[in-house]
Each structure stands twice: as structure tokens, then as C-alpha cells.
């Protein structure tokens, strides 16, 4: 992937949801869509003291770009204070910085809809000497708005006195006009109407439509998820075709098997994207046994706008196998968020990289949307690792203080799953005193008894990594749950917490 600078968004709560007597409050900053790592997030808290925490970066599934969140917790007279989140991305350029200044919370308002309309071609389908762009800003709660026109991202010197505002009932609308010469319009530049309102930015962009199909149609073919393969036992593979121009010609996707055997009936979905391109998805159910035995599946794509047919193949990953090690732990209580807690799960040293991560509570699998899991990343060795993060509420842990992180992976035995239980308050879990039983959150390699080192000949923890049961045969202080070896070019992850 090529270098991509981040988009930065402020994260605030609604003012009405913050108790008036709250002594501290948390706000955040999301940096998303960047590549490669890292970004550096710093905060300007004015006269107030604050503590910051930047979460590990997550990989965005389709693009392979990264996203990360930085949280700031401040106490004191925060209500009248403005805070600035400063995001630096040196891979974009040494001085690439984006600042977002905002207050702790946002008041209720109806945001505007921004839409650019453009003047028509003449009867012969040709562009007139000048082209008018009309920016319609509609349906917002009356208040100050700021309209800026951009040409290829650069602010234009435009007379905005022509902008007119009208009010219909409780909502307002504004429109601004931009006149361009035919030469500018045909130069293939992108024109953006950018609206700033209530500290937020809304925009719409337009450019001369391409004469033909957007270049660079791409096709991708996924492997079945281990969850679908081993737990649901109904694996599917998906052929994804992106960046097609909507046209009269339809995309033709044909499935086949290298063995020549027939394929099942596939389902197809077409979606128009915001950039005007079309995405086509075809999903094919495959036989669990066929897949495990190494069948190769092929997706052939043809389209009038594709110079030649595209073929994508997928089959079971070859190479060495290694079962995942699963470690689960709870973060300590954070000031001002006593009713929420974050659980984390480190899954590492597995091969190949295909893995499914689930969280369970009360023997029920939690929806995938509840947790955020990074894409597999290579460890220093030959395996892969992922982190998964789950936010739980007091109501949940008071109902039952046991959450399970489960990894589904082909090399895990006996049933392709490895799981670890974690409690928010491990000393109280199950009504037993911690000293009377093996703690829930002693972090050990998968496949071994909790708190006990692997049998002779098996792998033992690295000297820098700890299983904090306070046992003499494990190195390191008892309060350290686990320390993951520093990966190349990255800061070391260190997790602490009472065992």
C-alpha cells in the first residue's frame, strides 16, 4: 500500500449525558485511514491537567490502512475549556500535522446535508464556456456556518457574499455558487464545497466525469473464516470486484473448481459506493471437506470495461502450522469510568494467519460488533499475532464476572478452538478467595494447565515474559501478567494487572 495520511476526527460525548457533578471527563481523537504506522498523538489541555492513553492501532479490513484512538481524561473546570488534539504522521512528511480543537461535549443539533449541483451541458453534449457549481447546504439547526470552496484540496479565493440563507420551520438552508471557466473544469480537478458547522466539517466533491471506466478495477478472493469452517461448518468464500463504473454492461462472475467438479449456487450483491463506483460481491458456499483437502476455487470476472478477464484463485494456506497462544486480561479501573471496563485478548504465535476471534459471556457468543480485533501481524518469529478489545459494562460483570476470549484456528486441538477466561474483578470471581484457587487470569501458553509451566521439552516463556502467579518457577514479579516481546520497528506492548 502507498503512504496515506490520516483523517482525524474528534470524539466527544453528548453534553446531556455528562452528569453536572462529574469531576473528570474523557474525550478522544480518532486517526484513521493512514499507512504506514505510526502516528503520534499529543494533546494541548490548556491550563488543565490530563492523562492520555493511545490505543494500539487496528487494521482496516478492506484497505489495509490503520486506525488508532487517543483518549484524554481531564479533571477540574473542563466545561469552558477547549482542547486540541495534534496528530503527526511522519511517513506522509516530516511536518504533516492535523490539529482538531474542540470542547468536551457536543450539543444536540441537526447536521447539514451538503450537495453540489452542476450546470448542464448544452444540447450537443458539450460543455458551455462557463460551468456553475451550486453548493446546497440544507436541513441544519440554525447557527453559524462557514462555506469554503476547494480546488484539488486548496482553498479558492471565491466571493462568498452571494451565499444566501433561508429558514424553513426549525431548520435552515444555505446555498453558495461557484463559476468556473471551461478550461478549469476540463482540467480534471476536483472541486469541494466544505462546510464548517458546530466544530464539525461536512463536504461534497465533484469533478468532470471520466470519459470511460475508472482505471484499476480490482478483484479479490477471500478464504473462509475459521469460525465458518470449523464451528458453523458452513464455509463460504467471497469474490469482491471493486472500482467498476456503473454501466449498461453487467459484471459477469463465474465460479469454478480446479478439480473440474461442480460448484454450489452463489449469491451476488451489488453496491453503489459514495465515489460513484460499483462494488460487486459474489459469495460461494464451499464444502468443508473439499476445502480442508486442498481444493482450489476460482472466480472469473468479465465486464465490457475490462480489457481482459480477471481470474482469482484461493485454496487452503500451505506451510507450517502452529496453534495460537491465548492470553486474556482486564484493564484496571479508570478514573471516571467505573461502570465500564476494557478486556483485552492477545493471541499469538499461530500459523497460518487465518483466525477468528470471539468473545463469550454467560456461554453466549457476543456480537462481532461488540469487539474490535486487529488484523493478523507477523511476530518476530514466523508466527502471527492479533489483539482483540472488548468493552464490558458493570451490569454484565455483576451478572456474571467471567468473559471468555476464544480463538478459532485450524492448528488448535482438539476442536480448533483455544479459549481463556478473564474476570473484571478476579479476586471476587466465582465467590472464591483468590488464594484458594488458580486465578482466572494467570497467563500461560495455550494447551497447558493454568499457572503451570509447559512439560519438559515444550516451550517456556521468554525471560522477559511473565505469568504472574508469583510462582518460583516463573520469572518476573507476580504483578506482571504478560510482557510481549518487542516487535521490529514497534514499541513494546506491556500489560500489567493484578493476578
Amino acid at each position: 500500500a502507498s503512504t496515506q495520511s490520516p483523517s482525524v476526527f474528534p470524539l466527544t460525548r453528548c453534553c446531556k449525558n455528562i452528569p453536572s457533578n462529574a469531576t473528570s471527563v474523557t474525550l478522544g481523537c480518532l486517526a484513521t485511514g493512514y499507512f504506514p504506522e505510526p502516528v503520534m498523538v499529543t494533546w494541548d489541555t490548556g491550563s488543565l491537567n490530563g492523562t492520555t492513553m493511545t490505543l494500539p492501532a487496528t487494521t482496516l479490513t478492506l484497505s489495509g490502512h490503520y486506525a488508532t484512538i487517543s483518549l484524554l481524561t481531564v479533571s477540574g473546570a473542563w466545561a469552558k475549556q477547549m482542547f486540541t488534539c495534534r496528530v503527526a504522521h511522519t511517513p506522509s512528511s516530516t511536518d504533516w500535522v492535523d490539529n482538531k480543537t474542540f470542547s468536551v461535549c457536543s450539543r444536540d443539533f441537526t447536521p447539514p446535508t451538503v450537495k453540489i449541483l452542476q450546470s448542464s451541458c448544452d444540447g450537443g453534449g458539450h460543455f458551455p464556456p462557463t460551468i456553475q457549481l451550486l453548493c446546497l447546504v440544507s436541513g441544519y439547526t440554525p447557527g453559524t456556518i462557514n462555506i469554503t470552496w476547494l480546488e484539488d484540496g486548496q482553498v479558492m479565493d471565491v466571493d462568498l457574499s452571494t451565499a444566501s440563507t433561508t429558514q424553513e420551520g426549525e431548520l435552515a438552508s444555505t446555498q453558495s455558487e461557484l463559476t468556473l471557466s471551461q478550461k478549469h473544469w476540463l482540467s480534471d480537478r476536483t472541486y469541494t464545497c466544505q462546510v464548517t458547522y458546530q466544530g464539525h466539517t461536512f463536504e461534497d466533491s465533484t469533478k468532470k466525469c471520466a470519459d470511460s471506466n475508472p482505471r484499476g478495477v480490482s478483484a479479490y478472493l477471500s478464504r473462509p473464516s475459521p469460525f465458518d469452517l470449523f464451528i458453523r461448518k458452513s464455509p463460504t468464500i467471497t469474490c469482491l470486484v471493486v472500482d467498476l463504473a456503473p454501466s449498461k454492461g453487467t459484471v459477469n462472475l463465474t465460479w469454478s473448481r480446479a478439480s473440474g467438479k461442480p460448484v454450489n449456487h452463489s449469491t451476488r450483491k451489488e453496491e453503489k459506493q459514495r465515489n460513484g463506483t460499483l462494488t460487486v460481491t459474489s459469495t460461494l458456499p464451499v464444502g468443508t471437506r473439499d476445502w480442508i483437502e486442498g481444493e482450489t476455487y476460482q472466480c472469473r470476472v468479465t465486464h465490457p470495461h475490462l480489457p481482459r478477464a480477471l481470474m482469482r484463485s484461493t485454496t487452503k494456506t500451505s506451510g507450517p502450522r502452529a496453534a495460537p497462544e491465548v492470553y486474556a486480561f482486564a484493564t484496571p479501573e479508570w478514573p471516571g469510568s467505573r461502570d465500564k471496563r476494557t478486556l483485552a485478548c492477545l493471541i499469538q504465535n499461530f500459523m497460518p494467519e487465518d483466525i477468528s476471534v470471539q468473545w463469550l459471556h454467560n456461554e453466549v457468543q457476543l456480537p462481532d460488533a461488540r469487539h474490535s480485533t486487529t488484523q493478523p501481524r507477523k511476530t518476530k518469529g514466523s508466527g502471527f499475532f492479533v489483539f482483540s478489545r472488548l468493552e464490558v459494562t458493570r451490569a454484565e460483570w455483576e451478572q456474571k464476572d467471567e468473559f471468555i476470549c476464544r480463538a478459532v484456528h485450524e492448528a488448535a486441538s482438539p476442536s480448533q478452538t483455544v479459549q481463556r477466561a478473564v474476570s473484571v474483578n478476579p479476586g471476587l470471581a466465582g465467590g472464591s478467595a483468590q488464594s484458594q484457587r488458580a486465578p482466572d487470569r494467570v497467563l500461560c501458553h495455550s494447551g497447558q494447565q493454568q499457572g503451570l509451566p509447559r512439560a519438559a521439552g515444550g516451550s517456556v516463556p521468554h525471560p522477559r515474559c511473565h505469568c504472574g502467579a508469583g510462582r518460583a518457577d516463573w520469572p518476573g514479579p507476580p504483578e506482571l501478567d504478560v510482557c510481549v516481546e518487542e516487535a521490529e520497528g514497534e514499541a513494546p506492548w506491556t500489560w500489567t494487572g493484578l493476578c
Epitope: Q298, P304, R308, M311
Partner: antibody, heavy 119, light 110 residues
Framework: QVQLVESGGGLVQPGGSLRLSCAAS????????MTWVRQAPGKGLEYVSI???????WYANWASGRFTISRDNSKNTVYLQIDSLRAEDTATYYC?????????????WGQGTLVTVSS | DIQMTQSPSSVSASVGDRVTITCQAS??????LAWYRQKPGQPPKLLIY???TLASGVPSRFSGSGSGTEYALTISSLQPEDFATYYC????????????FGGGTKVEIK
């Protein structure tokens, strides 16, 4: 077996025109994208143009305007029309068949027809 | 445009030698890199497609590898008929302005 036979090459003066033909046999032409590739004497392969199964066509940027690719599936023939010929167009022109399943290159080539542009 | 850069432009080797030719694309290729062998006076012949799949009838001494932007063709034990010129081709889809072939590598007798 699959056969591609080019014809229409020869000696032509600068500024002249030529229409190259490629007769296909041993397979169903309408199932395949077809390509013209040229090779100047002692030089490497150079992609000229491609026509897909829908009849839509693309050209190398230097070829756009003077070269026209077309196909007649009923006659099992692919054509390449070259106008305003220049000395640098002197080359062997190969007609080639793209693999049916796609993304896999050219699985069959003709023997080529030599075009010589000289006054 | 995706540009294909082949190296070396020529290599001298003997029968039985192991020879590796590389091809670098100016941007990632998802699938569809092909390799050809061309003998003097003949059209090219497809050796490898989809990065690493051996074309029908091609001896197993030929192998293809690579992903993203870096690709290689390896001849494990050079035979007399392998003294020829080799070309890589980006065969995923032809953009109208691409020359989809590499510049060629001539394998000569030492």
C-alpha cells in the same frame, strides 16, 4: 489444435496504411480476449492493442489514434488497421490469444507477419 | 501506468546452471504475472502464469515466485534449448497506456 495465422504484412511507404488479419481456428474465438503484440527487429515485445469478448478495445498510449483493432467472430478473424505508417512501426506483428480464464497471459501466439515501412 | 523492469538484461551461463531472472513492477500486481521464453525467429511461449503456475507442457525445471512488486523466474538446471530471451508480462488487465511486457533477459552460453 489452436492456430493463429497472421497476414497482410509487407513493404509499405511512410504515410501509408495496412490492414493485418489474424485467422483463428481450433477454438471458439468469441470466448477469448485477443491481443496484438509487435516486436521491432532485435528489440523486445511491445503490447499494441487488446479487444475483449464484448468487442471493446484498448491501445498502448503511443498506438492510440493510428491503430484500430476489431474482430469478426463469425469469420473467426481479428484485424489490426494501421494508418499513417512510420519507419518506427517496422516490426513483426503477432496476433495472440489471451487465456480463457483470465489474468494469465497469452497462451497461444501466431507466427507473426512482418511490416516494413520504408521509402 | 504499471511499468515492468526486468533484470539482468543478459546473463551468461552453462548447461546445468541455476539461473534466476527478476521482474519488478512499479506497483503491486494482485495476480496475473506471466513469463515467456522466446527463441530466435519464433513467437514467445508461455512458461508461467498467475505468478507461479506452470503452463501446460512446460518442464518442472522452470518455477515462478514472488508477490506484490517483486517477481522471479528460476531455471533450476539450464538445458541447451533454454538459451533464449525471457520476458515477464503483467497480465492482470491491460491499461490502455501500459506496455505490459518487461524489457527482456537474454540467456547466453558462457
Amino acid at each position: 489444435q489452436v492456430q493463429l495465422v497472421e497476414s497482410g504484412g509487407g513493404l509499405v511507404q511512410p504515410g501509408g496504411s495496412l490492414r493485418l488479419s489474424c485467422a483463428a481456428s481450433g477454438f471458439t474465438l468469441s470466448n477469448h480476449d485477443m491481443t496484438w503484440v509487435r516486436q521491432a527487429p532485435g528489440k523486445g515485445l511491445e503490447y499494441v492493442s487488446i479487444i475483449n469478448t464484448y468487442g471493446n478495445h484498448w491501445y498502448a498510449n503511443w498506438a492510440s489514434g493510428r491503430f484500430t483493432i476489431s474482430r469478426d467472430n463469425s469469420k473467426n478473424t481479428v484485424y489490426l488497421q494501421i494508418d499513417s505508417l512510420r519507419a518506427e512501426d517496422t516490426a513483426t506483428y503477432y496476433c495472440a490469444r489471451e487465456t480463457h480464464h483470465g489474468s494469465s497471459g497469452i497462451d497461444h501466439w501466431g507466427q507473426g507477419t512482418l511490416v516494413t515501412v520504408s521509402s | 501506468d504499471i511499468q515492468m523492469t526486468q533484470s539482468p538484461s543478459s546473463v551468461s551461463a552453462s548447461v546445468g546452471d541455476r539461473v534466476t531472472i527478476t521482474c519488478q513492477a512499479s506497483e503491486s500486481i494482485y495476480s496475473g504475472l506471466a513469463w515467456y521464453r522466446q527463441k530466435p525467429g519464433q513467437p514467445p511461449k508461455l512458461l508461467i502464469y498467475d505468478h507461479s503456475t506452470l503452463a501446460s507442457g512446460v518442464p518442472s525445471r522452470f518455477s515462478g515466485s514472488g508477490s506484490g512488486t517483486e517477481y522471479a523466474l528460476t531455471i533450476s538446471s539450464l538445458q541447451p534449448e533454454d538459451f533464449a530471451t525471457y520476458y515477464c508480462q503483467h497480465a492482470d488487465y491491460a491499461h490502455h497506456s501500459d506496455n505490459v511486457f518487461g524489457g527482456g533477459t537474454k540467456v547466453e552460453i558462457k
